[in-house]
């Protein structure tokens, strides 16, 4: 079937394949210190690591991509590790009228897959 | 704001940045010749190319990733070029009872962005 089972065990060794990793960043790092008040520091979960053949395939397209990359590595790139879902984050920020809260749905990754 | 405008002009030169490219593949290439009858050959649109800073950013997370990659390139990978949408494709395939048609929603990319 088009939906071959994506692999969930990493053939490259521990921590090498696509996974969620926490990166600490300040508002200064993000260039947000002029408008965001809080939190001053964010634990930003990001997707890092390699995507070996069929590892955590996002969908049929990713499975095809993995296969064609094996056949034509110069023409077709390997799938890469990107967020599959996000955790909403609330930021307290300055507005013209004072301080406001806003929730961002697409800021911190919650899960990763190979697309 | 968190939503800096993603760039749409490629600073690396024509065809170098994230874009849609057609790859021709046979059923044999895909390993589907035993169950798919038609089409015998697929024009598979795929996302290829690099993702320089803020080029076609998928969302806020991708913008952050691009910025942190500039600050910590060994720790944070650059965003990568993945499908933003798909074109459905109808395949004619064998079943236990004969031949059937099935639409696959996630097989051929229609648009790309940097995630």
């Amino acid at each position: 079937s088009a939906h071959a089972h994506p692999r969930d065990s990493c053939p490259l060794g521990p921590g090498r394949c696509c996974h969620l990793e926490t990166v600490q960043a300040t508002l200064e790092d993000l260039g947000w210190s002029d408008w965001v008040l809080s939190p001053r520091q964010l634990q930003l979960s990001m997707c890092v690591g390699e995507c070996p053949h069929l590892y955590r395939s996002a969908n049929t397209h990713a499975q095809i991509k993995a296969r064609l990359h094996g056949l034509q590595p110069d023409k077709v790139p390997a799938p890469c590790c990107v967020p599959s879902s996000y955790t909403p984050v609330v930021l307290m920020h300055r507005t013209d009228s004072g301080v406001s809260l806003q929730t961002y749905d697409d800021l911190v990754a919650r899960g990763c897959h190979c697309a | 704001s968190a939503h800096a405008h993603p760039r749409d002009s490629c600073p690396l030169g024509p065809g170098r940045c994230c874009h849609l490219e057609t790859v021709q593949a046979t059923l044999e290439d895909l390993g589907w010749s035993d169950w798919v009858l038609s089409p015998r050959q697929l024009q598979l649109s795929m996302c290829v190319g690099e993702c320089p800073h803020l080029y076609r950013s998928a969302n806020t997370h991708a913008q952050i990733k691009a910025r942190l990659h500039g600050l910590q390139p060994d720790k944070v990978p650059a965003p990568c070029c993945v499908p933003s949408s798909y074109t459905p494709v109808v395949l004619m395939h064998r079943t236990d009872s004969g031949v059937s048609l099935q639409t696959y929603d996630d097989l051929v990319a229609r648009g790309c962005h940097c995630a």
């Epitope: 809080s38 939190p39 307290m92 806003q102 929730t103 | -």
Partner: antibody
Amino acid sequence: EVQLVQSGAEVKKPGESLKISCKGSGYSFTDYWISWVRQMPGKGLEWMGIIDPSGSYTIYSPSFQGQVTISADKSISTAYLQWSSLKASDTAMYYCARVSYYGGYFDIWGQGTLVTVSS
Amino acid sequence: DIQMTQSPSSLSASVGDRVTITCRASQSISNNLNWYQQKPGKAPKLLIYAASNLQSGVPSRFSGSGSGTDFTLTISSLQPEDFATYYCFQLDHSPFTFGQGTKVEIK
């Protein structure tokens, strides 16, 4: 154990002032925001406002702006809700809640402080 | 300000019943909605965050769905301890607001 402990029930007269407290323990107090929620007798929950204890930034619901003051003392891991002049309509249960900015939810709640204002 | 409208305001159900509570926002709030349960004399308790994510320790019979303006809390098989009042809460942007509550009573 992570918890928020609120001060005890209060009975006051209209026009009096009041400050109730919410003490956090078992976690880093400045890593989370604190919200206050009102529940009038037999009624639903109302969001009053929020404070960031690390920078003492506050945001109020328009319904409560100018009616109450939210503050915090990070040195003793305590948030406060205060009134300068109570009204009978302030009679309610008041809850403090810890706010996780990841997810935006109120994950830990105080036990509530019942405030009764009556002449 | 965003208004949150819950329906029904109350319902009677039996143990084992499937119960559905809906919440409508006056404007789109993406998936920025939480559900809380409150029992008499107790502080509220988080059930669902980000519209569909089950809080740790909450039984799997509770589920949430929806996005934009329309949201649903479902209890697949009502248990005796589920008789309570349920509130939706939007946190898309301040001022945050609760729905008026849905009281689930024993039939």
